[in-house]
Interface confidence: low
């Protein structure tokens, strides 16, 4: 689509005569008829296949034509065409005398013709005017012409349609050859794809307008390059979405189970050595002079009853001192000057002679101890209960009262809530500090995976661009059926169709 433009510049008819040679009365009131048609080697009569245009009366006899509207006419004259410009043409320009105001061809006598010129040739589309002058015996016409493309048409023959736009179908202006030039921030064949924020992750991010970075599910951050860990992940990280890879010293599905209580909480006091002994459990090995689960209690050195055989203990600044009863000596009154003849065994203990009667040993009845059976047994002094269990004396025996989650004579066993396989339908069981949690396979839900559910993978409307979503019931996944012009597993990528252009 384009326009053939004809600019009339000057017409000379000095004698004011018609083509027949007759003079015009009172002068030649001149107007023009123009016929544009396909190339003919000899311009013959027939339809003006490319169009016609006529002017009002532009002057009398000889006159110059202004470069604008004259008496309602237009200069240059416009001959629009709605086809590919062929590059060749035939042009006929007739000058006529108008005796009255009716300029219709049927209203004029044939002899009102002043002059007729016909040219033919090649003409390329372009902005430059071709200047021409045609002279006959009595008249001279100076004019120029060119072919330009209509708005939105481009190329050597005005066949390339390009309409600048900034909407859903594209964001571009048109180059002189009709090719698209994308507006800043847009790319693609039809400039429909926004250029996302610089650095926006290619797979994990996308955008619907320039300089934007929207994250796909499971990703976050300005550039969508940070994965989102499993919901509830406490002390863990991820390298792909919904992971929960535990930090050093943490365990469990949500990395919320403390496997390094010693480091994280430093429970042991007074320089004691801490040993991890399972989830949230530990043992403190106290330095001399301290006791308690966390070695928080300071001991008198006499509290450990170091003096044997009934010796009495006296605390001193640098330790302790044993005052031995008659018949005993040594740092802890451990050496005896007594023999079985002296009946040294108390509380019903039996005396046995050793070293040919130079020494003896007492065999104590239950609940008594000491070299002379002089001490009643406290079965809790050795702290036998593990994992923070509380030791209770029960007459001749002792008993451990365990903290929740532990069992066994000495609270040494960790109770597993998962031991009885509580998760139905192949659910995975996870021990938590205060109970358990079931991770259900696809198609099941409930605290124990006991509820069968039908997964509608389409429920979240995963398909874009008005695509139809189908649920694959065998795999509980979705399939997007893309409308014309879109591709991708979610129909998120336009392919530029329907096209806006005929090439």
């Amino acid at each position: 689509s384009g326009v053939f433009q004809l600019q009339l510049q000057e017409f000379i008819n000095e004698r004011g005569v018609l083509a027949s040679g007759r003079p015009c009365e009172p002068g030649c009131r001149t107007f023009f008829r123009v016929c544009l048609k396909h190339f003919q080697a000899v311009v013959s009569p027939g339809p003006c296949t490319f169009g016609t245009v006529s002017t009002p009366v532009l002057g009398t006899n000889s006159f110059a034509v202004r470069d604008d509207s004259s008496g309602g006419g237009r200069n240059p004259l416009q001959l629009p065409f709605n086809f590919t410009w062929p590059g060749t043409f035939s042009l006929i320009i007739e000058a006529w005398h108008a005796p009255g105001d009716d300029l219709r061809p049927e209203a004029l006598p044939p002899d009102a013709l002043i002059s007729k010129i016909a040219i033919q040739g090649s003409l390329a589309v372009g902005q430059n005017w071709l200047l021409d002058e045609q002279t006959s015996t009595l008249t001279r016409l100076r004019y120029s012409y060119r072919v330009i493309c209509s708005d939105n048409y481009y190329g050597d023959n005005c066949s390339r349609l390009c309409k600048k736009r900034n909407d859903h179908f594209g964001h571009y202006v048109c180059q002189p050859d009709g090719n698209l030039s994308c507006l800043p921030g847009w790319t693609g064949e039809y400039c429909q794809q926004p250029i996302c924020l610089s650095g926006c992750h290619e797979q994990n991010g996308y955008c619907s307008k320039p300089a934007e970075c929207l994250c796909r599910p499971g990703w976050q951050g300005r550039l969508c390059n940070e994965c989102i860990p499993h919901n509830g992940c406490r002390h863990g990280t991820c390298s792909t979405p919904w992971q929960c890879t535990c930090d050093e010293g943490w365990g469990g599905l949500f990395c919320d189970q403390d496997l390094n209580y010693c480091t994280h909480h430093s429970p042991c006091k007074n320089g004691a050595t801490c040993s991890n002994s399972g989830q949230r459990s530990y043992t403190c090995t106290c330095r001399p002079g301290y006791t308690g689960v966390d070695c928080e209690l300071e001991l008198s050195e006499c509290d450990s009853n170091p003096c044997r055989n009934g010796g009495s203990c006296k605390d001193q600044e640098d330790g302790y001192h044993c005052l031995c009863p008659p018949g005993y000596y040594g740092l802890h009154c451990e050496h005896s000057t007594l023999s079985c003849a002296d009946s040294p065994c108390f509380n019903g203990g039996s005396c046995r002679e050793r070293n040919q009667g130079a020494n003896y040993a007492c065999e104590c009845p239950p609940n008594f101890t000491g070299s002379n059976c002089e001490k009643k047994v406290d079965r809790c002094t050795s702290n036998p209960c593990a994992n923070g269990g509380q030791c209770l004396n029960r007459g001749p025996s002792r008993m451990c009262r365990c903290r929740p989650g532990f069992t066994g004579t000495y609270c040494e066993l960790h109770v597993s809530d998962c031991a009885r396989n509580p998760c139905a339908h192949g659910g995975t069981c996870h021990d938590l500090e205060n109970g358990l949690m079931c991770t259900c396979p696809a198609g099941f839900s409930g605290r124990r995976c006991e509820v069968r559910t039908s997964i509608d993978a389409c429920a979240s409307s995963p398909c874009f661009n008005r695509a139809t979503c189908y649920t694959d019931l065998s795999t509980d996944t979705f399939v997007c059926n893309c409308p014309y012009g879109f591709v991708g597993s979610r129909c998120e990528f336009p392919v530029g169709l329907p096209p806006s252009f005929p090439w």
Partner: antibody
């Protein structure tokens, strides 16, 4: 203001072809910012979308699956109208047939205006 | 295809009283751009349907402000704050998320 005026026969015999016309004024049938839809209405099916045609450097059609094998849209740029042809009609095709313009804005198209409707009865 | 279910099918109303119509979709009409692709049309007796509301809540040109639309995803509502004589007719919801476009069965608002 865009106006749509429909014309076509009110009675068609079974197995014959139905042809309806929708004349457009106030817009061009080959406008690159409109689509021309056909909808029918019957007591049994309610409002049923049959399809649409639109021009984007060339003509494109979308048809409803229920009529895809029998329906054709024919735009006529010289007369600035759209015609619908439905082949091999049956009494099931008895309905009021509407054409409607879908304005193709950046984000959305909706049906406005509608033609006055053509009541078609399929009967021998 | 997306199914639209309207309720009630019939709604007797006294002029001046409010009215409310529900439209439920078999799948979400909400796209990631934030728009729900649902329109409301009114068909008066002996006339063609006419556009009332598009994109859930945008009133078409010339539609009085007593009409309002709301909802998102699969549940949508059309409300008339005070029904007037010219409001009687059949109201249809239509989804334009994807072709084929589909309509509800209609709600007939009639004089009580």
């Amino acid at each position: 203001q865009v106006q749509l005026v429909q014309s076509g026969p009110g009675l068609v015999k079974p197995s014959q072809n139905l042809s309806l016309t929708c004349a457009i004024s106030g817009d061009s049938v080959s406008s690159d910012s409109a689509a021309w839809n056909w909808i029918r209405q019957s007591p049994s099916r309610g409002l049923e979308w049959l399809g649409r045609t639109y021009y984007r450097s060339k003509w494109y059609n979308d048809y409803a699956v229920s009529v895809k094998s029998r329906i054709t849209f024919n735009p006529d740029t010289s007369k600035n109208h759209i015609s619908l042809q439905l082949n091999s009609v049956t009494p099931e095709d008895t309905a009021i047939y509407y054409c409607a313009r879908e304005g193709d804005n950046w984000n959305y198209g909706w049906l406005d205006p509608w033609g006055q409707g053509t009541t078609v009865t399929v009967s021998s | 295809d997306i199914q639209l279910t309207q309720s009630p099918l019939s709604l007797p109303v006294t002029p001046g009283e409010p009215a409310s119509i529900s439209c439920r979709s078999s799948q979400s009409l909400l796209l990631s751009n934030g728009y729900n692709y649902l329109d409301w049309y009114l068909q008066k007796p002996g006339q063609s349907p006419q556009l009332l509301i598009y994109l859930v809540s945008s009133r078409a040109s010339g539609v009085p402000d007593r009409f309002s639309g709301s909802g998102s995803g699969t549940d949508f509502t059309l409300k008339i704050s005070r029904v007037e004589a010219e409001d009687f007719g059949i109201y249809y919801c239509m989804q334009a998320l994807q072709t084929p476009y589909t309509f509800g069965r209609g709600t007939k608002v009639e004089i009580k």
